[in-house]
């Protein structure tokens, strides 16, 4: 299922570099959210719980992210030219049932107020 | 088509040890949680332990805590259950199950485990 | 821990009858809208297989025949019309907190 643009401030700038917002519903409770830059994985986490309720948290890919109980945030630093391209949260919901795919993005522009080290 | 497959079971003394393993087949192994289940012959269910993904996360009933261990090889798609210190009590079939999320929704047709002398 | 007690220990009910298996917890296995309470029917010789998640969800494949119903601390799983495959033993479990626990089982058969 592809939901297309998001319906709210996907990326936040700040100190050279972007905060990037992937949303989920509150009633999510175990999921895989993975950042995709065009078609390429650049972090993803996951969320899920054992059979006795405990909560495991796992990055395949290595990313400054942050979780909230209805987001994750994915943080890209030192920002140039090449950051801009479309940015997507892929979210796979694994609980609760059905499962169930959403896919939201954005496109990331990148001007030279934003970028990390100007040249002078 | 998921199949967990266990072996290592048998017959050890008192106090023996033994290692239990669980191949798993037919779905991303690293992507679930995975349990040990007891049954004692003619009696009920039991959980005996679970490890999250990589292994990070360990669980142990109290029965069995500091006698029994878990682990997961996942390039190998397989779990284990490395059982020290065993008991007349311990005697069971183990079963391998793995936890779909929100249940058990996959489990293997166990391993038979007698402690006696 | 969290104590599963179920009632009645076994039953016999004629085929085309109804069955009804009850399961209480120590505590309330409520949370964030959900009961964390599951089901399986185990057979003689086989592992146990998922019927029921979420106290009333059925699992993939399972016939309609069976339900599950209740909130809180009481659960109850319906046979609506008990067929000869339907002989078995059957567990409610909770995965509300760690460790998980089963109930001792409900034996059902043919009167």
């Known amino acids: 299922e592809i939901n297309g643009s998001a319906n709210y401030e996907m990326f936040i700038f700040h100190n050279g570099g972007v905060q990037i917002l992937c949303k989920y519903p509150d009633i999510v409770q175990q999921f895989k959210m993975q950042l995709l830059k065009g078609g390429q994985i650049l972090c993803d986490l996951t969320k899920t719980k054992g059979s006795g309720n405990t909560v495991s948290i796992k990055s395949l890919k290595f990313c400054h992210s942050q979780l909230s109980n209805n987001s994750v945030s994915f943080f890209l630093y030192n920002l140039d030219h090449s950051h801009a391209n479309y940015y997507f949260c892929n979210l796979s919901i694994f609980d609760p049932p059905p499962f169930k795919v959403t896919l939201t993005g954005g496109y990331l522009h990148i001007y030279e107020s934003q970028l990390c080290c100007q040249l002078k | 088509e998921v199949q967990l497959v266990e072996s290592g079971g048998g017959l050890v003394q008192p106090g023996g040890s033994l290692r239990l393993s669980c191949a798993a087949s037919?779905?991303?192994?690293?992507?679930?949680?995975m349990d040990w289940v007891r049954q004692a012959p003619g009696k009920g269910l039991v959980w005996v332990s679970n490890?999250?993904?990589?292994?990070?996360?360990?669980n142990f009933a109290p029965s069995v805590k500091g006698r029994f261990t878990i682990s997961r090889d996942n390039a190998k798609n397989t779990l284990y259950l490395q059982m020290n210190s065993l008991r007349a009590e311990d005697t069971a079939v183990y079963y391998c199950?793995?936890?779909?999320?929100?249940?058990?929704?996959?489990w293997g047709q166990g391993t038979l485990v007698t402690v006696s002398s | 821990d969290i104590v599963m007690t179920q009632s009645p220990d076994s039953l016999a009910v004629s085929l085309g009858e109804r069955a009804t298996i009850n399961c209480k917890s120590s505590?309330?296995?409520?949370?964030?809208?959900?009961?964390?309470l599951i089901w399986y029917q185990q057979k003689p010789g086989q592992p146990p297989k998922l019927l029921i998640f979420?106290?009333?969800t059925r699992h993939t494949g399972v016939p309609d025949r069976f339900s599950g119903s209740g909130s809180g601390t009481d659960f109850t799983l319906t046979i609506s019309s008990l067929q000869a495959e339907d002989v078995a033993v059957y567990y409610c479990?909770?995965?509300?907190?760690?460790?998980?626990?089963f109930g001792p089982g409900t034996k059902v058969d043919i009167k």
């Open positions: 979420y106290a009333s």
């Open positions: 479990q909770h995965h509300y907190s760690s460790p998980p626990t």
């Open positions: 490890i999250d993904h990589d292994g990070n996360i360990i």
């Open positions: 199950a793995r936890w779909g999320h929100y249940a058990f929704d996959s």
């Open positions: 505590q309330s296995l409520l949370s964030s809208g959900y009961n964390y």
């Open positions: 037919g779905f991303t192994f690293s992507d679930y949680w």
